[in-house]
């Protein structure tokens, strides 16, 4: 089955923006929202934002979590507000964080 093609006039969503790429803004607009977690020298760095171009998020959002990085994507206004990306933890989850699974 072919990957879904982007629409000519794609819907843009408002997303929460938290992280290095956000500047002074706390939101951004794009075709997909994301919530990510990366491990930098053993420290958890959480980011949220948007992919403004469909192709930009296409591969990233399909990448399964690894021990050093996880990304959760969604489509809908502010849909990443309550999403916390999590690393695979062999059946255990970190205390104080939410589990989120894409259907």
């Amino acid at each position: 089955m072919e990957d879904e093609k982007p629409k000519v006039n794609p819907k843009l969503y408002m997303c929460v923006c938290e992280g290095l790429s956000c500047g002074n803004e706390d939101h951004c607009e794009g075709q997909q929202c994301f919530s990510s977690l990366s491990i930098n020298d053993g420290f958890h760095v959480y980011q949220k934002g948007c992919f403004q171009v469909y192709e930009q998020g296409k591969m990233t959002c399909k990448t399964p979590p690894s021990p050093g990085q996880a990304v959760e994507c969604c489509q809908g206004d502010w849909c990443n507000r309550n999403i916390t990306a999590q690393l695979p933890t062999k059946g255990k989850s970190f205390p104080g964080t939410q589990n989120f699974h894409l259907e």
């Epitope: 053993g42 958890h44 760095v45 980011q47 021990p67 255990k92 970190f94 205390p95």
Partner: antibody
Framework: EVQLVESGGGLVQPGGSLRLSCAAS????????MYWIRQAPGKGLEWISS????????YYPDSVKGRFTISRDNSKNTVYLQMNSLRAEDTAVYYC???????????WGQGTLVTVSS | DIQMTQSPSSLSASVGDRVTITCKAS??????LNWFQQKPGKAPKLLIY???SLQTGIPSRFSGSGSGTDFTLTISSLQPEDFATYYC????????FGQGTKVEIK
């Protein structure tokens, strides 16, 4: 109550080795990343190592890479720091610390002093 | 590595004073910054995480602000137990501490 208790410090000659231990209690040890931070006498703080929950990923700054090794034993709720090829500049109080995923270095042990001198 | 520059390196203040300590990062670290308090012979104690979140059990006279490269720790009304050394710490990349700010009694 979270408790982190370091041990194993002492006097060692330059070029020598030492293994520090940090015994943890009051939380589910195997769920948390652990860290070592040091502080030379009268100086500031320096992060020197991190380890993930299962011990499979370890991290070091260049200043100790190749000489220090962090490890953990989740069955004993203990994290270790093996220090080899010690130098005078490694003289410091060594602290063990833990994070929660959202709060880096939330808890610290009381520290153990390592003195490297001939 | 990201350099963290704290200022001032030391300051003298009186009980009841408003005290401000700044930390400047050599590059953008967003809000990935903590503040610690350390007293002589003791381990550092976390005061503020994620730039402006107050750690549980820390008095509300402590507050943090900033994003990007410029950060501030403020003690709204200095208390006798606040005389200590304060460190900022960034974990955006290559974790590093500031050099410390010693708060002394005037």
């Amino acid at each position: 109550e979270v408790q982190l208790v370091e041990s194993g410090g002492g006097l060692v000659q330059p070029g020598g080795s030492l293994r520090l231990s940090c015994a943890a209690s009051g939380f589910t040890f195997s769920n948390y990343y652990m860290y070592w931070i040091r502080q030379a006498p009268g100086k500031g703080l320096e992060w020197i190592s991190s380890i993930n929950t299962d011990g499979g990923s370890t991290y070091y700054p260049d200043s100790v890479k190749g000489r220090f090794t962090i490890s953990r034993d989740n069955s004993k709720n203990t994290v270790y720091l093996q220090m080899n090829s010690l130098r005078a500049e490694d003289t410091a109080v060594y602290y063990c610390a833990k994070s929660t995923p959202n709060i880096p270095l939330a808890y610290w042990g009381q520290g153990t002093l390592v003195t490297v001198s001939s | 590595d990201i350099q963290m520059t704290q200022s001032p390196s030391s300051l003298s203040a009186s009980v009841g004073d408003r005290v401000t300590i700044t930390c400047k990062a050599s590059q953008n670290i967003y809000k990935y910054l903590n503040w610690f308090q350390q007293k002589p012979g003791k381990a550092p104690k976390l005061l503020i995480y994620y730039s402006n979140s107050l750690q549980t059990g820390i008095p509300s006279r402590f507050s943090g602000s900033g994003s990007g490269t410029d950060f501030t720790l403020t003690i709204s009304s200095l208390q006798p137990e606040d005389f200590a050394t304060y460190y900022c710490f960034q974990y955006s990349s290559g974790p590093t501490f500031g050099q410390g700010t010693k708060v002394e009694i005037k």
